[in-house]
Interface confidence: low
């Protein structure tokens, strides 16, 4: 069946060194356990995280993200997933695309991550 992919409309903010969560879901909500779900960096980019055949596909992941991502699948039965990125870097700033693929039908949603310097916000004294 057909569905839309929905991500956060506004940029998500994170501090360098922290972790950040990028939520993504399909509408209408349905079980996505058997789907391929992933994140990549547009426009021609590398795999940030990929879930396929019921498990995370670490081998397909871009080296910069190995060991730093986790797909939170508690609500995947309702078509909701969240990508957690640990130890956020300045190079993580920018666009991410989340996609769901059900057989040959694929939809995606773009989202933006803003990365800030934690020390910039420390007030003197």
């Amino acid at each position: 069946g057909q569905f839309r992919v929905i991500g956060p409309r506004h940029p998500i903010r994170a501090l360098v060194g922290d972790e950040v969560e990028l939520p993504c879901r399909i509408s209408p909500g349905k079980n996505a356990t058997g789907m391929e779900v992933g994140w990549y960096r547009p426009p021609f980019s590398r795999v940030v995280h990929l879930y396929r055949n019921g498990k995370d596909q670490d081998g397909d992941q871009a080296p910069e993200y190995r060991g730093r991502t986790e797909l939170l699948k508690d609500a995947i039965g309702e078509g909701k997933v969240t990508l957690r990125i640990r130890n956020v870097r300045f190079s993580d700033e920018g666009g991410f695309t989340c996609f769901f693929r059900d057989h040959s039908y694929q939809e995606e949603a773009a989202m933006e991550l803003k990365v800030e310097d934690p020390f910039y916000w420390v007030s003197p004294g």
Partner: antibody
């Protein structure tokens, strides 16, 4: 070490189509972008388009939009470039090129190249 | 589309010379720039990626620099095997090559 092996030379008539293949071996095929680049005789390099096999969606240079189709078959680790409505100006060597693993995020690559396929368009 | 202007188109030099070719982008591309060497009848060979990172196996006499809109490729102490054509490439979004610089024997 990733290697790309392309199909052999082709001679085509104006108005026809050509499909060039590019088979990858020795690395992860699905996650890394494959580009197609052409070089007319005595001319420079021209990017035509590219694809990340795992996503299946190709991106094309504006100049070739509507005339080129780039696809990838994950099961055989092979990428394809089909160019239609051929004209004499399409006579060129066509290269596939792929990003080597371990490069930067958002880095399209073109670090590993095929040997090139000469396509001659002549009546 | 972002345009890449490469200069000079031809460069005459001798073995041992230090030579530089430059590339200018029509808008800022951060460090999304690569350099390639091509010899007649051969596929291009990657030399530099991300503006200044040397590909493994490439001699250290090759170096890249720049960021934003202006970039350089420098060959220190030109060797006989370095006579070739050099291309820059941006891949900030839709990739575009420079027109090429042919390094020929003076």
């Amino acid at each position: 070490q990733m290697q790309l092996v392309q199909s052999g030379a082709e001679v085509k008539k104006p108005g026809s189509s050509v499909k060039v293949s590019c088979k990858a071996s020795g690395g992860t095929f699905s996650s890394y972008a494959i580009s197609w680049v052409r070089q007319a005789p005595g001319q420079g390099l021209e990017w035509m388009g590219g694809i990340i096999p795992i996503f299946g969606t190709a991106n094309y240079a504006q100049k070739f939009q509507g005339r080129v189709t780039i696809t990838a078959d994950e099961s055989t680790s092979t990428a394809y470039m089909e160019l239609s409505s051929l004209r004499s100006e399409d006579t060129a060597v066509y290269y596939c090129a792929r990003a080597r693993e371990g490069l930067l995020v958002n880095y399209y690559g073109m670090d590993v190249w095929g040997q090139g396929t000469l396509v001659t368009v002549s009546s | 589309d972002i345009q890449m202007t490469q200069s000079p188109s031809t460069l005459s030099a001798s073995v041992g010379d230090r030579v530089t070719t430059t590339c200018r982008a029509s808008q800022g591309i951060s460090n999304y720039l690569a350099w390639f060497q091509q010899k007649p009848g051969k596929a291009p060979k990657s030399l530099i990626y991300a503006a200044s990172s040397l590909q493994s196996g490439v001699p250290s006499r090759f170096s890249g620099g720049g960021s934003g809109t202006d970039f350089t490729l420098t060959i220190n102490s030109l060797q006989p095997e370095d006579f070739a054509t050099y291309y820059c490439l941006h891949d900030y979004n839709y990739p575009t090559f420079g027109q090429g610089t042919k390094v020929e024997i003076k």
